[in-house]
């Protein structure tokens, strides 16, 4: 019954948050 991330309705927003965090991390490392 435990879902994969892609099946979860939260996945879309979670991926967006993850991408934004990655971008912030990149900028911080520059």
């Amino acid at each position: 019954c435990i879902h994969h991330l892609d099946e979860s309705p939260h996945s879309q927003a979670l991926k967006k948050v993850f991408a934004e965090n990655k971008e912030i991390q990149k900028l911080a490392e520059q």
């Epitope: 435990i2 879902h3 979860s8 309705p9 996945s11 879309q12 927003a13 967006k16």
Partner: antibody
Framework: QIQLVQSGPELKKPGETVKISCKAS????????MNWVKQAPGKGLKWMGW????????TYTEEFKGRFAFSLATSASTAYLQINNLRNEDTATYFC??????????WGQGTSVTVSS | DVVMTQTPLSLPVSLGDQASISCRSS???????????LHWFLQKPGQSPKLLIY???NRFSGVPDRFSGSGSGTDFTLKISRVEAEDLGVYFC?????????FGAGTKLELK
């Protein structure tokens, strides 16, 4: 402010088709998934599935595979629920709801669908 | 599917009382990412459900602090410290850790 505004009540005959709209405003439509929930008269809430507003990919629960279809008009920030070949047991109020990383935070006001011959 | 069992189904209160609603899940709601996706909604007659508490204990924007959520694993509680007239309605717990998302049957908070 964030709002989900659904289309008005529908009275249909068995075998007909209905298409419900859910217009989003106050946020970036393609950043959040959209849930659809059914509530039969005097009953609880039943999750029908969701649509990814970025990719357009719908996900349906077992009960709602076949006659039900989620779709989008992304340019109009609108999600749709279509029910084909309506049955009496489809009589219910249908809600759309925005899905964040944490929860289902904002819901539409609901659209009442009555199926009667 | 995860079954959400709410108790009681009806809760008669007087204004100013404390109210407590229980929600038990048929399996753990701890997601592999560590989050617990257990939420509480209030639905008033003729309206859509409104989010009160998300992820067990987080109050949603604009929700008064008389509402609090607690719990872990499979056992969760919503407490209203002092019931006001605007709090009357049907409370639903919901889980979104597992697909399909599921809801409790609802608890009707009503006046004695």
């Amino acid at each position: 402010q964030i709002q989900l505004v659904q289309s008005g009540p529908e009275l249909k005959k068995p075998g007909e088709t209905v298409k419900i709209s859910c217009k989003a405003s106050g946020y970036t439509f393609t950043n959040y998934g959209m849930n659809w929930v059914k509530q039969a008269p005097g009953k609880g809430l039943k999750w029908m599935g969701w649509i990814n507003t970025d990719t357009g990919k719908p996900t349906y629960t077992e009960e709602f595979k076949g006659r039900f279809a989620f779709s989008l008009a992304t340019s109009a920030s609108t999600a749709y629920l279509q029910i084909n070949n309506l049955r009496n047991e489809d009589t219910a109020t249908y809600f759309c709801g925005r899905v964040t990383a944490d929860s289902m935070d904002y819901w539409g006001q609901g659209t009442s669908v009555t199926v009667s011959s | 599917d995860v079954v959400m069992t709410q108790t009681p189904l009806s809760l008669p209160v007087s204004l100013g009382d404390q109210a407590s609603i229980s929600c038990r899940s048929s399996q753990s709601l701890v997601h592999s990412n560590g989050n617990i996706y257990l939420h509480w909604f209030l639905q008033k007659p003729g309206q859509s459900p409104k989010l009160l508490i998300y992820k067990v204990s987080n109050r949603f924007s604009g929700v008064p602090d008389r509402f609090s959520g607690s719990g872990s694993g499979t056992d969760f509680t919503l407490k209203i410290s002092r019931v006001e007239a605007e709090d009357l309605g049907v409370y639903f717990c919901s889980q979104s850790t597992h697909v399909p998302l599921t809801f409790g049957a609802g608890t009707k908070l009503e006046l004695k």
